[in-house]
């Protein structure tokens, strides 16, 4: 669940998620609305969609704890756990590397962004 995600994002990006990403823009952190503000925000919007899909599949996205290995900068999702746990790991792995890919466009001004300013059409999944 959330502990896995925090640890994974820290390992991959080198940033403390609680200080750098939760919240950030209009979609990083709990909830999400409006048009994503930048590429980093798009990572989180896509991750929300990934979680939404798993919810429709009956997975407990915040409760399920999965196993994974982090070595030489890569994440390997373990095939030990249940289907839901493995898919959850895949969602989190994707967002972690997406955030890393977009570190160069990270904007400090979007940290703790005021959500009422998040306007426009929320992208569909």
């Amino acid at each position: 669940g959330i502990l896995n995600l925090n640890k994974m994002v820290k390992q991959v990006t080198g940033k403390m998620p609680i200080l750098s990403y939760w919240p950030y823009g209009c979609h990083c952190g709990l909830g999400g609305r409006g048009q994503p503000k930048d590429a980093t925000d798009w990572c989180c919007q896509t991750h929300d969609c990934c979680y939404d899909h798993l919810k429709t599949q009956g997975c407990s996205i915040y409760k399920d704890y999965y196993r994974y290995n982090f070595s030489q900068g890569n994440i390997h999702c373990s095939d030990k756990g249940s289907w839901c746990e493995q898919q959850l790991c895949a969602c989190d792995k994707e967002v972690a590397f997406c955030l890393k890919r977009n570190l160069d466009t990270y904007q400090k001004r979007l940290r703790f962004y005021w959500r009422p300013h998040c306007r426009g059409q929320t992208p569909g999944c």
């Epitope: 599949q57 009956g58 249940s82 289907w83």
Partner: antibody, heavy 124, light 106 residues
Framework: QVTLKESGPGILQSSQTLSLTCSFS??????????VSWIRQSSRKGLEWLAH???????RYDPSLKSRLTISKDTSRNQVFLKITSVDTADTATYYC????????????????WGTGTTVTVSS | QIVLTQSPAIMSASPGEKVTISCSAS?????MYWYQQKPGSSPKPWIY???TLASGVPARFSGSGSGTSYSLTISSMEAEDAATYYC?????????FGAGTKLELK
């Protein structure tokens, strides 16, 4: 040829600890992704998965029984063990050990080879 | 945990008859696995990943389903098919089994 064979006390008293052994051949628990589960079967509750141990000593338990279960292994002797504490008559069952199938799909989790089972009776 | 409900609990079929055994999950599962068990023997893997027959399983058996509804079908019942069939899931932890369907020869 892969085989598994369970052994246990047969009969024991309520409140005692049940110790079971699964001796296997034809595969090694040091092989990556390999794992063995304990499953029991009773007329009251049907088939009930209890615990699973992986090649790297990672363990999983049925949450409703977790506090009473301990699974362990001796890789060199090709054995897996299960301990159940504070047994009562509800633990009367046939106990099986079974190997998790090594599938091409990581998300598969089923059992391709089962032991013959050992019958355990708990008397009050 | 996900509860698997099998129906019917007991059924009988004549040789040559088509047989369908159902397994209903209390919430969505990705795949279903099936085992066959005969009296005095341990369960044998029968169908995995919903529809793939295990090694040595006759082609008259098939598996299908998605979501919460799965089934095992025998196109033409034979005497050796008389057994108890169990479904199993590991979509979410913990792994669970159905209570079984006992198939008898009429």
């Amino acid at each position: 040829q892969v085989t598994l064979k369970e052994s246990g006390p047969g009969i024991l008293q309520s409140s005692q600890t049940l110790s079971l052994t699964c001796s296997f051949s034809g595969f090694s628990l040091s092989t990556s992704r390999m794992g063995v589960s304990w499953i029991r079967q009773s007329s009251r509750k049907g088939l009930e998965w209890l615990a699973h141990i992986y090649w790297d000593d990672d363990k999983r338990y049925d949450p409703s029984l977790k506090s009473r279960l301990t699974i362990s292994k001796d890789t060199s002797r090709n054995q897996v063990f299960l301990k159940i504490t504070s047994v009562d008559t509800a633990d009367t069952a046939t106990y099986y050990c079974a190997r998790r199938a090594l599938s091409d799909y990581g998300s598969d989790f089923y059992f391709d080879v089962w032991g013959t089972g050992t019958t355990v009776t708990v008397s009050s | 945990q996900i509860v698997l409900t099998q129906s019917p609990a007991i059924m009988s079929a004549s040789p040559g008859e088509k047989v369908t055994i159902s397994c209903s999950a209390s919430s969505i599962v990705s795949y279903m696995y099936w085992y066959q068990q005969k009296p005095g023997s341990s369960p044998k893997p029968w169908i995995y990943r919903t529809s793939t027959l295990a090694s040595g399983v006759p082609a008259r058996f098939s598996g299908s389903g998605s979501g919460t509804s799965y089934s095992l079908t025998i196109s033409s019942m034979e005497a050796e098919d008389a057994a108890t069939y169990y479904c199993q899931q590991y979509h979410t932890y913990p792994l669970t089994f159905g209570a079984g369907t006992k198939l008898e020869l009429k």
